[in-house]
Amino acid sequence: MAPWPELGDAQPNPDKYLEGAAGQQPTAPDKSKETNKTDNTEAPVTKIELLPSYSTATLIDEPTEVDDPWNLPTLQDSGIKWSERDTKGKILCFFQGIGRLILLLGFLYFFVCSLDILSSAFQLVGGKMAGQFFSNSSIMSNPLLGLVIGVLVTVLVQSSSTSTSIVVSMVSSSLLTVRAAIPIIMGANIGTSITNTIVALMQVGDRSEFRRAFAGATVHDFFNWLSVLVLLPVEVATHYLEIITQLIVESFHFKNGEDAPDLLKVITKPFTKLIVQLDKKVISQIAMNDEKAKNKSLVKIWCKTFTNKTQINVTVPSTANCTSPSLCWTDGIQNWTMKNVTYKENIAKCQHIFVNFHLPDLAVGTILLILSLLVLCGCLIMIVKILGSVLKGQVATVIKKTINTDFPFPFAWLTGYLAILVGAGMTFIVQSSSVFTSALTPLIGIGVITIERAYPLTLGSNIGTTTTAILAALASPGNALRSSLQIALCHFFFNISGILLWYPIPFTRLPIRMAKGLGNISAKYRWFAVFYLIIFFFLIPLTVFGLSLAGWRVLVGVGVPVVFIIILVLCLRLLQSRCPRVLPKKLQNWNFLPLWMRSLKPWDAVVSKFTGCFQMRCCCCCRVCCRACCLLCDCPKCCRCSKCCEDLEEAQEGQDVPVKAPETFDNITISREAQGEVPASDSKTECTAL
């Protein structure tokens, strides 16, 4: 995974050259023919590639320009057409199709289950710490602290609904005001977008696939970050979310509703509850400063308990300690009062793997974290493989056209809004934005859905998760109804405001441009994806948290210069690209800065050195592990047994001369095999549905 060679004497135009094949439509670069833009700070260079060593001939030719890497790849059909098959072939193909569908649904099921278990694992590892974040008294006065707590807690428990429900219970108990809760909700919105970003990392094995998947996942992150960047200051200044939601809550006389329908959980719960069951009340109790809860385990042991509420007489030091004056008496020596006591009798143990192990939460969490990531990774690879074999030819064309085509003029603008509704509806059905966006990520990766279409679907998903929260709020008990409904509505209007900011006008769709930029960087320097994840979801929130604890003065003292530098850089960047003549010659580019400040190349060298020690060991594992380890170390030479690393090896073999392949391939399939795209063995058995 070393960076692409950069030629110092290349032409000023950063043209990209690629091999072509007879009859092949122009395709986006794939694993064997990847090209990448270098950092815009470096001298523009030409990217070139050689054919695989076994090709018949190569002709040095004028380089031909290749399509934008963001164009969807053409998923070619390599199989025998349906009409050309005999009856046996048709029957075989039909059952093959059914088998694939069953496998796809099976892997999808385990994919969703592994997401659920991943969330449980994160709660076991960081749940108690997350609860302690909430017990910080500064949240009330510092919205920035509230925001980062929302991010950190949601990242730690991998569930925005968990962090939101903690906030609701704290507001209901008057430990938190709605005003203080709003930034936490905004943070939870950001935190929940880490899940699909983690899922995107699993597609690291293929550069072009990873570029699209990572951009598709981070479009959610950027939307949330940008929305907070604009709306948090607006909310702090005007309290518009608090005011609007308060008016709505006060103007309606809500009656307690039904619980939000658990549609997906009904299917996944029977499996996930056999793995582990958690007592999520513990995190809430810690958040509400319950000392006893700190020593409780999150792993649920008893599933059937009998709770008996009785009133018992207890002695108290003085009449001042009595429950009420009328419930106070003496026996002549001691003062007594009556207390409501709940006796909990354990009846039946839970039926999950960890019930009798009595392991510490951290151990259970670590085991589940590793296993769920492996299952998640494995399922994702299999889903991508199955989809890759199914979505070919006309099937792919139909699906891609259906999903990515706009309505006819003049209603084209409506398509995106329909996608928002579809995203909201789908999320409402699966009851989780993480599940929906995570399922979307591999589809973006393999090129079924464009980022432009994924963006409104993701925005819809954000809305869908808030409608679920509103329904859940309506089902709350009387005392929590108002606060939970107001918080759910704050969440809803925050997302609506975000959509109004970053969707209606195409020019304002900044998240797409930012995600594509990050996708390009991450496709070239794959370690940067992990770096981004750590920086944005852990280091920045933790730094702000630490500075906030130190007090307002420290936060402002450090924050203001940092913000000032960022604004300065952005303004300079804008002037450089739009009107460089305004600037002095030195500032017209970034060359005045040392290389490490303007390029990732030196950092890449550092990372490569650092991971060098893993290179001989990291890749000789099964294909499932390969994607995870390729992400960890740029290892082109270390893994002959693993497809993804073989591809990398091939991709890096010779890169000196711009080449064009002669149009001598027998058919598309051979050409694609030569490019390492389809295993030769698959080509004969492939069947087309249409």
Epitope: N313, P325, S326, W329, T330, D331, Q334
Partner: antibody
Framework: QVQLVQSGAEVKKPGASVKVSCKTS????????MHWVRQAPGQGLEWIGA????????AYNQKFKGRVTMTADTSTSTVYMELSSLRSEDTAVYYC????????????WGQGTLVTVSS | DIQLTQSPSFLSASVGDRVTITCKAS??????VAWYQQKPGKAPKLLIY???TRHSGVPSRFSGSGSGTEFTLTISSLQPEDFATYYC?????????FGQGTKLEIK
Amino acid sequence: QVQLVQSGAEVKKPGASVKVSCKTSGYTFTTNNMHWVRQAPGQGLEWIGAIYPGSGATAYNQKFKGRVTMTADTSTSTVYMELSSLRSEDTAVYYCARGMYGHGAMDYWGQGTLVTVSS
Amino acid sequence: DIQLTQSPSFLSASVGDRVTITCKASQDVGTAVAWYQQKPGKAPKLLIYWATTRHSGVPSRFSGSGSGTEFTLTISSLQPEDFATYYCQQYSSNPLTFGQGTKLEIK
């Protein structure tokens, strides 16, 4: 059955002390408080104080504080009430009564001990 | 100290009559009130505690009611053995105090 048997009548001079005993049987001595109540001739009932034999903890009516001492002997299941600096108005029937567990109602009473203070 | 005032101080009634004795507390005592019956030359006997709970062995014609500051003892149908003096007692706070008593006589 629960029984509370008090010591016999006493005649005392003003300024003297009197010690009345109350021997209990029929229940666990250390679980219930023992109260002392007095009744002057033709008058109502007046609470003197109480003792918890299990720990020896006592509580006295402010009116008698400094003059009254209550003790318990767990080996004989007997409680004692000593009243010092006797005055003529201390002439009364002194009752020991078992307190019900957890509250101040008295369910079993001794037969009473008449203490007469006269010069 | 909490004062308890019983009324009436004297009460004449016949066998079979329904009799009500009231007890007023100077402050809220909740339901921490007991009623006793005392016959001449004898020790008091517990009838009611917690304002309404009959002690074991006490006939059902005796009943108590009230909470806070006003309490009543009712004898639904007077029997010859019921003619005695009745005391209310509060155990809401120390010192424990008794009412001055209500003497029930045969008419």
